[in-house]
């Protein structure tokens, strides 16, 4: 019989969504083409289930790691990259004293046991988000 | 493969001027900052400061401000440090090194070094 | 600018005996995101510093697993669980919490 496999190799399972981990770094906007060109998006978190999660994969690897967020269009205004704003509910997730825009921090990475705004230039790892695939019927 | 290779030796003289390079490969420049650190004949590990490749902000350790100045070319993939007022005490080997900020900060790929003599 | 301190300076060893180096910060590297910004570097005879160590405990990736991180706040270990002969050098420890970096005197392994 066929199983069905709602998310590629590599990419991890959770509440509907497909999830992949990068193993090496790009600059935040590079992060972005790296994954629209797996047909999927730097993470937007929509829950707070799901920032859990992410913010779990993250710190357990102990790597420091691009989402899909930004004030690049406007400083002190947070967006997500499918143009949503952020929630002010969501920014209890910054570390303490973040974001502080030191020299121009323009893009939020998953750090340690929070998010950190840093430079957009800098080469990190990142995580792409796609929907998982039907496997009913 | 990631490398950094620096200039060679030099002689200098007191009071005259040094400029080290530092030519990055197998990676992108722009991603990661580039610091200076020195070694004294014998001694320990000195920080002099970084640059960041992409926009060239500099931060530099308060001993060496005024007297060392960090630049790169992005077209050319190189970093340069050069340092002025040259004592006796500045002789040293001088290292570039790549900060990965995928892993904190870490100084994960060095250059090999470059001897810098300061003698009269 | 926050000082470093190593011990022991000089650290004699046995092949397949364990060893181990204190590093000491003046003010903790403790960091609001959780992670201690301490690392680890070994500079063989001859040779440009390598990395072992980074956030404190964190092997970086082809360093081999008889060595070791731990610590928090003020005060680190780095621990050889087996030493090997390719283990000498001068191990030194660098906080990167804050500019300027600064790292420890180093201590010099030497196999007895």
């Known amino acids: 019989e066929r199983l069905c496999h709602p998310c590629p190799w590599e990419w991890t399972f959770f509440q509907g969504n497909c999830y992949f981990m990068s193993n090496s770094q790009r600059n935040w906007h590079d992060s972005i083409t790296a994954c629209q060109e797996v047909g999927a998006q730097l993470v937007v978190i929509k829950s707070a289930e799901e920032q859990n999660f992410l913010q779990l994969q993250s710190s357990r690897s102990n790597r420091f790691t691009w989402m899909g967020l930004s004030d690049l269009n406007h400083e002190g205004t947070w967006q997500w990259v499918d143009g949503s704003p952020l929630l002010p509910s969501f920014k209890q997730y910054w570390n303490k004293g973040e974001p502080n825009n030191v020299g121009e921090e323009d893009c939020a990475e998953f750090s340690g046991n929070g998010w950190n705004d840093d430079k957009c230039n800098l080469a990190k790892f990142w995580i792409c988000k796609k929907s998982a695939a039907s496997c009913s019927g | 493969q990631v490398q950094l290779v620096q200039s060679g030796a030099e002689v200098k003289k007191p009071g005259a001027s040094v400029k080290v390079s530092c030519k990055a490969s197998?990676?992108?420049?722009?991603?990661?900052?580039i610091n200076w650190v020195r070694q004294a004949p014998g001694q320990g590990l000195e920080w002099m400061g970084w640059i960041n490749p992409n926009s060239g902000d500099t931060n530099y350790a308060q001993k060496f401000q005024g007297r060392v100045t960090m630049t790169r070319d992005p077209s050319i993939s190189t970093a340069y440090m050069e340092l002025s007022r040259l004592r006796s005490d500045d002789t040293a080997v001088y290292y570039c090194?790549?900060?990965?900020?995928?892993?904190?900060?870490?100084?994960?790929?060095w250059g090999q070094g470059t001897l810098v003599t300061v003698s009269s | 600018d926050i000082v470093m301190t190593q011990s022991p300076l000089s650290l004699p060893g046995t092949p397949g005996e364990p060893a181990s180096i204190s590093c000491r910060s003046s003010q903790s590297l403790l960091h609001s995101n959780g992670y201690n910004y301490l690392d680890w570097y070994l500079q063989k005879p001859g040779q440009s510093p390598q990395f072992l160590i980074y956030l404190g405990s964190n092997r970086a990736s082809g360093v081999p697993d008889r060595f070791s991180g731990s610590g928090s706040g003020t005060d680190f270990t780095l621990k050889i669980s087996r030493v090997e002969a390719e283990d000498v050098g001068v191990y030194y420890c660098m906080q990167a919490l804050q500019t300027p970096y600064t790292f420890g005197q180093g201590t010099k392994l030497e196999i007895k």
């Open positions: 090194a790549r900060e990965n900020s995928g892993y904190g900060k870490l100084f994960d790929y």
């Open positions: 197998g990676y992108t420049f722009t991603g990661y900052y």
